[in-house]
Interface confidence: low
């Protein structure tokens, strides 16, 4: 199906920028992996690069305005021609849910005092209103609460006196047209306008004041322009060459408003001075290689020794990474393919341990399932041996850091019947439903 093709993908907002044009296939648009596309105007924007997770959205508002609730955020798998980590298809949402508390206490209503006395009538003639008030203090509200209803009420009052009506001008009527629209005619053009004393008319009994000033005014038409000449378009110029060497580009034609040139305030040519066309080089754009993440460190060993585990003997280990995605003469990955370091092996070594403090509370899990809970842990943490942190190399190479490697077997005193992990769980409260933000906009 044809798509709308854009030249940029804005990572921060997930929006497509720089519309190239429509009516092209996803495959043609994504000849350039820096481009992005939409299946329909205003729809979800997908970049042409390999799929990866977007940034997390901001946390949604707390599900309740007071006491403890929960809030959601999401991220989306965006990209083309592949899957995100966890074998997730582009367009898929992933959710996180956490506990929140906007305000510790919930508002409590207050009660009204009795009504105060009526204030005097608001006018001295005809009919007006009078008002009385009451206070929200019986009892006073708590935690941002309020009293139901209004703090004041009004009623009509009649002074039994007739009011005079003073005259006032209605707005000026329009100026009459000048006798000519261009300068140089036989008569000196004039324009006139008038107004009525009708907004309102002055009353007879009791007598109101008449409108001040004149009911009409006249002026000379000045600064009339010479008669205008409308502009006309010249022919379209040649089509510009395709400005790109790969993927899709945009060519342009131009024309000039000089056939004739507009004169004496005549209108400029209607329509566009330029028009564009999509040009297709049918050549894929180069794609630079990108390093995969580093692989696992190899076991910590020393040549000619069967095992150095649990001993103060430095060994060596290495890890590697792969340069992926290089296509169409793109740049190779910069940097080293292999990383080597010095190490002490503590693999399966029994070490004295100590209990950590409680971790912070984790996210609510599952974020979109029934009865989510959050947890925190205390871990039996191994105390590492006090081996030298560096080793001296052959002359001229200086000192090298040595890293502990391996999974030791920490030993802690039993805590709540556990030897390695103590976990505490708590339910998450007032959990909102997971809803696709794209669906909510429709």
């Amino acid at each position: 199906d044809p798509v709308l093709c854009f030249t940029q993908y804005e990572e921060s907002s997930g929006k497509c920028k720089g519309l190239l044009g429509g009516g092209v296939s996803v495959e043609d648009c994504c000849l350039n992996t820096a481009f992005a596309y939409q299946k329909r105007s205003g729809g979800l924007c997908q970049p042409c690069r390999s799929p990866r997770w977007s940034l997390w959205s901001t946390w949604a508002p707390c599900s309740v305005t007071c006491s403890e609730g929960s809030q959601l955020r999401y991220r989306r798998c965006v990209g083309w021609n592949g899957q995100c980590s966890g074998k997730v298809a582009p367009g898929t949402l992933e959710w996180q849910l956490q506990a929140c508390e906007d305000q510790q206490c919930c508002p409590e209503m207050g009660g009204w005092s009795g009504w105060g006395p009526w204030e005097p009538c608001s006018v001295t003639c005809s009919k007006g209103t009078r008002t009385r008030r009451r206070a929200c203090n019986h009892p006073a509200p708590k935690c941002g609460g309020h009293c139901p209803g209004q703090a004041q009420e009004s009623e009509a009052c009649d002074t039994q006196q007739v009011c005079p009506t003073h005259g006032a001008w209605a707005t000026w009527g329009p100026w009459t047209p000048c006798s000519a629209s261009c300068h140089g005619g036989p008569h000196e053009p004039k324009e006139t306008r008038s107004r009525k004393c009708s907004a309102p008319e002055p009353s007879q009994k009791p007598p109101g004041k008449p409108c001040p000033g004149l009911a009409y005014e006249q002026r000379r038409c000045t600064g009339l322009p010479p008669c205008p000449v409308a502009g006309g378009w010249g022919p379209w110029g040649p089509v510009s060459p395709c400005p790109v060497t790969c993927g899709l580009g945009q060519t342009m034609e131009q024309r000039t408003c000089n056939h004739p040139v507009p004169q004496h305030g005549g209108p400029f040519c209607a329509g566009d001075a330029t028009r564009t066309h999509i040009c297709n080089t049918a050549v894929p754009c180069p794609v630079d290689g990108e390093w995969d993440s580093w692989g696992e460190w190899s076991p910590c060993i020393r040549r000619n020794m069967k095992s150095i585990s649990c001993q103060e003997i430095p060994g060596q280990q290495s890890r590697g990474r792969t340069c992926r995605g290089r296509k169409f003469d793109g740049h190779r990955c910069a940097g080293q393919q292999q990383d080597i370091r010095h190490c002490y092996s503590i693999q399966h070594c029994p070490l004295k341990g100590s209990w950590s403090e409680w971790s912070t509370w984790g996210l609510c899990m599952p974020p979109c399932g029934p009865n989510p809970t959050r947890a925190r842990q205390r871990l039996c943490t191994p105390l590492l041996p006090k081996y030298p942190p560096t080793v001296s190399m052959v002359e001229g190479q200086g000192e090298k850091n040595v890293t502990f490697w391996g999974r030791p077997l920490p030993r802690c005193e039993e805590l709540q019947g556990q030897k390695l992990v103590v976990e505490e769980k708590r339910p998450c409260l007032h959990v909102p439903a997971c809803k696709d933000p794209e669906e909510e906009e429709l």
């Epitope: 966890g86 074998k87 997730v88 298809a89 898929t92 029934p370 997971c434």
Partner: nanobody, 119 residues
């Protein structure tokens, strides 16, 4: 783990109808979206229709008004009713389940069922 088994594919003439069914088993309590995707020879796999846990649906523009997706939570099935079929609907149709676990989402796919629409 979640297992998905599709059924109901086959050969049909243009303008005819088919009903695809997908049965889910395993850890189905945490599934929030069920969907049908399709893949024609030499083309990308594309979304046909999707239904969320709360019943909201999304359809591809090319099938709107012709296909209907529904789910039966009691039987743990999702169904795609396909009417007014066209030759361009010919593809392998895959059932998909999106599950949210403690450490994020997981995608599960069925083996696929072939739908062929002849002109």
């Amino acid at each position: 783990e979640v297992q998905l088994v599709e059924s109901g594919g086959g050969l049909v003439q243009a303008g005819g109808s088919l009903r695809l069914s997908c049965a889910a088993s395993g850890r189905i309590s945490s599934i929030i979206h069920m969907a049908w995707y399709r893949q024609a020879p030499g083309k990308q796999r594309e979304l046909v229709a999707e239904i969320s846990r709360v019943g909201t649906t999304v359809y591809a523009d090319s099938v709107k008004g012709r296909f209907t997706i529904s789910r039966d939570d009691a039987k743990n099935t999702v169904t795609l009713q396909m009417n007014s079929l066209k030759p361009e609907d010919t593809a392998v149709y895959y059932c998909n389940a999106l599950q949210y676990e403690k450490h994020g989402g997981a995608d599960y796919w069925g083996q696929g069922t072939q739908v062929t629409v002849s002109s």
